[in-house]
Amino acid sequence: QQWELQGDRRCQSQLERANLRPCEQHLMQKIQRDEDSYGRDPYSPSQDPYSPSQDPDRRDPYSPSPYDRRGAGSSQHQERCCNELNEFENNQRCMCEALQQIMENQSDRLQGRQQEQQFKRELRNLPQQCGLRAPQRCDLEVESGGRDRY
């Protein structure tokens, strides 16, 4: 019980320190791109609500550095996302909480059941794409009241 409380506290502080925004950016851009390739309305980057120009007072720590040579846009967001998720690798329950937080943060922006399912599918694949161990059981349903927390 004591260990679990400490574990929960540690996870909470890790979640508070984490910036999961790059994960959200990467996933939204990916599903929008996938929709484009199926002939939906084009997704204009200038309409991206995450565009750094929307937040002029804050230096975006996710802007390119001289060491970033692997293309801009979504792959850069994905690399930043991987670095954030990497902090949770040894705590599978906390990794799940991070994925749930991403799902919750974006649920209002997802249009329709199909987009929601696609977002969820991509979200589940995120850890593996970063070479990280994915949580075995992780309920990403936003609607359900009592979620399985791991």
Partner: antibody, heavy 116, light 108 residues
């Protein structure tokens, strides 16, 4: 990336190696230590995540070497203890983007010599 | 742990030759496979990551291929600057990183 702290020590001795990064958002990157014994191949010895929550070691150094980082100083450290002659090597630090899991930026290395 | 082997250990070749180096893993490494070039007294240089993706600034005469447990690095036309030692490296969630023993490419 610039390493420092190498030198000669007797068996059983200790050293602290440093690796300073410049021109990079340091806390965004997983960092690693890789060593190369004279005339031998490359051996990965340790990795540390961007904020230091996860640290990994090769079996050959686990329990003797400790990796840490100070993001305010853009520095990663490798503390070497209980050194043996087998630890004599050139020690490199290297950056790893997690999407590639490859070492894309390396330091020039710092030499550690363990001899009686 | 995943053990990496490379063949040949030494390769004698001439400028203009097509050179192939093979790397084998003791178990599948998915796509987490990279190749490096190292010259004496220097740090290694990343050439290829994720099996076949050329690192920025690396000449197109270098290419990588393979899957599962067997991978190859090919230099289509060996140049004077290419005489060096080449290492493969894998990443695995459980055993983390490991390198092959290296292949020295020397002048015939």
């Amino acid at each position: 990336l610039v390493e420092s702290g190498g030198g000669s020590v007797p068996p059983g001795g200790s050293l602290r190696l440093s690796c300073v990064a410049s021109g990079v958002y340091f806390s965004d990157w997983a960092m690693n230590w890789v060593r190369q014994a004279p005339g031998k191949g490359l051996e990965w010895i340790s990795s540390i995540s961007g904020r230091g929550a996860n640290i990994y070691y090769a079996e050959s150094v686990r329990g003797r070497f400790t990796t840490s980082r100070d993001n305010s100083q853009n520095t990663v450290f490798l503390d070497l203890t209980d050194l043996t002659v087998e630890d004599t090597a050139l020690y490199f630090c290297a950056k790893t983007p997690l999407l590639t899991r490859a070492f894309d930026v390396w330091g020039q290395g710092t030499a550690v010599t363990v001899s009686a | 742990d995943i053990v990496m082997t490379q063949s040949p250990s030494t390769l004698s070749a001439s400028v203009g030759d097509r050179v192939t180096i093979t790397c084998r893993a003791s178990q599948s490494v998915n796509t987490w496979l990279a190749w490096y070039q190292q010259k004496p007294g220097k740090a290694p240089r990343l050439l290829i990551y994720k099996v076949s993706t050329l690192e920025s600034g690396v000449p197109s005469r270098f290419s990588g291929s393979g899957s599962g447990t067997e991978f190859t690095l090919t230099i289509s036309s060996l140049q004077p600057d290419d005489f060096a030692t080449y290492y493969c490296q894998q990443y695995n969630i459980d055993s983390r990183y490991s390198f092959g023993p290296g292949t020295k490419v020397e002048i015939k």
